[in-house]
């Protein structure tokens, strides 16, 4: 099994994966296989009303760049508070002894898995016991020294919506063959999206591929700078009883998902007032309604908040509220 896989994101579309070779490989490691899969956001995120008092936005951090070659602190859960990090204590003699035993056990266990559990996959279509799972069609990059061509995942995840994640069968999962190195830059990923990465060490290429048990690691790409901005105009309609219906377009490709909108409005000469609009409420109104407004000139601006934080405020929109008691009831709306 490849050791100590570390995944970090250095941009909104890339994840860097690094690992160490198995401590006691069965034969020579010829290559590594890296698979990656987009993770759906936790369904609980869709259920919560983030406009409720006291409900904090979910902690969703991307996987920050490496601090040092051997640092593993970014392997912690993405929900963990980074302020809780601390240095590791020096190892005791008993710990060192235990690690040696574990290393020995790992070697024996891997031998067992290779010889007993795993049947080598047949690449030919001849008779005999074949792996019942779909064969993983590989884009072979040849035995190029330190060059790895990144395979974009755009085609694997058609952009049908910002929150639904397609489940693709195993043979369609994007993957990469890595030769002569212990790192890979995975490119063409979606911004601020969690990925589950699977890493295998292989000690034979042809005719039968023999690979280790997979090591897994998770990472989230960095946010896209303007992805949470509301694009297009904020429009309004004024109904009777001084109800103003504000409407806007949701960001097309937000960072994760939009959890709420902030509406900031003020009447000329008055203090600014704030309104929180939940996902659910937005779905009902395609915006929100301001009720019981006093007559006067108003300005309003709106910003979206995603899993990654706030987008930019829109340019102000202006409207005028008349005293509806003085207006005929058949005013065009």
């Amino acid at each position: 099994v490849p050791l100590d896989p570390i995944s970090v994101s250095n941009s909104s579309s890339q994840i860097i994966l690094k690992w160490k070779p198995p401590s006691d490989p069965n034969g020579n490691i010829t290559h590594y296989l890296v698979f990656w899969e987009r993770q759906a956001e936790d369904s609980e995120l869709f259920e919560l009303d983030y406009c409720l008092k006291g409900l904090k936005l979910p902690s969703r951090t991307w996987s920050p760049p490496f601090e040092s070659e051997d640092s593993q602190k970014h392997n912690q859960s993405e929900y963990e508070d980074s302020a809780g990090e601390c240095c590791s204590c020096p190892k005791t003699d008993s710990q060192i002894l235990k690690e040696l035993e574990e290393s020995s056990f790992r070697k024996t266990f891997e031998d067992y898995l290779h010889n007993v559990v795993f049947v080598p996959r047949k690449t030919s279509s001849g008779t005999g016991a074949e792996d019942p799972r779909p064969s993983r069609k590989r884009r072979s990059l040849g035995d190029v020294g330190n060059v790895t061509v990144a395979v974009p995942t755009v085609a694997a995840f058609p952009n049908t919506s910002s929150t639904s994640v397609p489940t693709s069968p195993e043979e369609h999962r994007p993957f990469e063959k890595v030769v002569n190195k212990e790192s890979l830059v995975i490119s063409g990923l979606r911004h601020f999206t969690g990925y589950r990465i699977e890493l295998q060490a292989c000690n034979q290429d042809t005719p039968e591929e023999r690979c280790s048990v997979a090591a897994y690691v998770s990472a989230r790409t960095m946010p896209e700078a303007k992805a949470d901005d509301i694009v297009g105009p904020v429009t309004h309609e004024i109904f009777e009883n001084n109800v103003v219906h504000l409407m806007w377009q949701e960001p097309k490709e937000p960072n994760g998902l939009i959890v709420l909108y902030e509406v900031s409005y003020r009447r000329y000469g008055d203090e600014e007032l704030h309104l929180c609009v939940s996902r659910k409420h937005f779905a009902l109104e395609r915006g929100c309604r301001l009720r019981g407004l006093s007559p006067g000139n108003y300005s309003v601006r709106i910003r979206a908040t995603s899993l990654a934080g706030n987008g930019s405020w829109t340019e102000p929109t202006y409207f005028y509220v008349t005293d509806y008691l003085d207006v005929p009831s058949n005013i065009a709306k």
């Epitope: 869709f46 109800v243 709306k333």
Partner: antibody, heavy 116, light 108 residues
Framework: EVQLVQSGAEVKKPGESLKISCKGS????????IGWVRQMPGKGLEWMGI????????RYSPSFQGQVTISADKSISTAYLQWSSLKASDTAMYYC?????????WGQGTLVTVSS | SSELTQDPAVSVALGQTVRITCQGD??????ASWYQQKPGQAPVLVIY???NRPSGIPDRFSGSSSGNTASLTITGAQAEDEADYYC???????????FGGGTKLTVL
């Protein structure tokens, strides 16, 4: 393409239970309300109720409150309309539709026939 | 709950303009949406909001609103426009929806 696909026609006896489904695709199912509408033979459209699959918040028309149950399973992008005890007067075409400042698109409809 | 009232039937000569109306108190607070339904088919949204057409709906369809009345206008009616038309709106509370009784449009 945004689509709602409903389950097939049903023939039931009075007193039986029934659950019909409406599967959404091509959009984020949890982000839009789904309404249910009844159309009795030769009659107009009647609004029954609506559900937000994100948290299963549901609102019913007073005419249908207690008569039917609307639910959703967001893991399979499906909304449901169910009866615990059907009556002959429940014979109708039932449509689901996505709310997006108007109901669009609509499912193809599920014909429910209740007859002894 | 609110009620929306529509004329049961309206006819129009081919190529002429026809207006279908919908009345109800909830229309003072919410716009109507309009649906076309042909025999044996599911309804289709033709107008929503102040006067918005979904993609694929011909521009001969338009909507307007004044006071407690919403109108659907078909300018230059075609034979394929013959159908039942329903208006719908949220009720005054905003928590429920209501449909009008429907208007059967005949194109002569």
């Amino acid at each position: 393409e945004v689509q709602l696909v409903q389950s097939g026609a049903e023939v039931k006896k009075p007193g039986e239970s029934l659950k019909i489904s409406c599967k959404g695709s091509g959009y984020s199912f949890t982000s839009y309300w789904i309404g249910w509408v009844r159309q009795m033979p030769g009659k107009g459209l009647e609004w029954m109720g609506i559900i937000y699959p994100g948290d299963s918040d549901t609102r019913y028309s007073p005419s249908f409150q207690g008569q039917v149950t609307i639910s959703a399973d967001k893991s399979i992008s499906t909304a449901y309309l169910q009866w615990s005890s059907l009556k002959a007067s429940d014979t109708a075409m039932y449509y689901c539709a996505r709310w997006d400042a108007g109901y669009s698109p609509w499912g193809q409809g599920t014909l429910v026939t209740v007859s002894s | 709950s609110s009620e929306l009232t529509q004329d049961p039937a309206v006819s129009v000569a081919l190529g002429q303009t026809v207006r279908i109306t919908c009345q109800g108190d909830s229309l003072r607070s919410y716009y109507a949406s309009w649906y076309q339904q042909k025999p044996g088919q599911a309804p289709v949204l033709v107008i929503y909001g102040k006067n918005n057409r979904p993609s694929g709906i011909p521009d001969r369809f338009s909507g307007s609103s004044s006071g407690n009345t919403a109108s659907l206008t078909i300018t230059g009616a075609q034979a394929e426009d013959e159908a039942d038309y329903y208006c719908s709106s949220r009720d005054s509370s905003g928590d429920q929806w209501v449909f009008g009784g429907g208007t059967k449009l005949t194109v002569l």
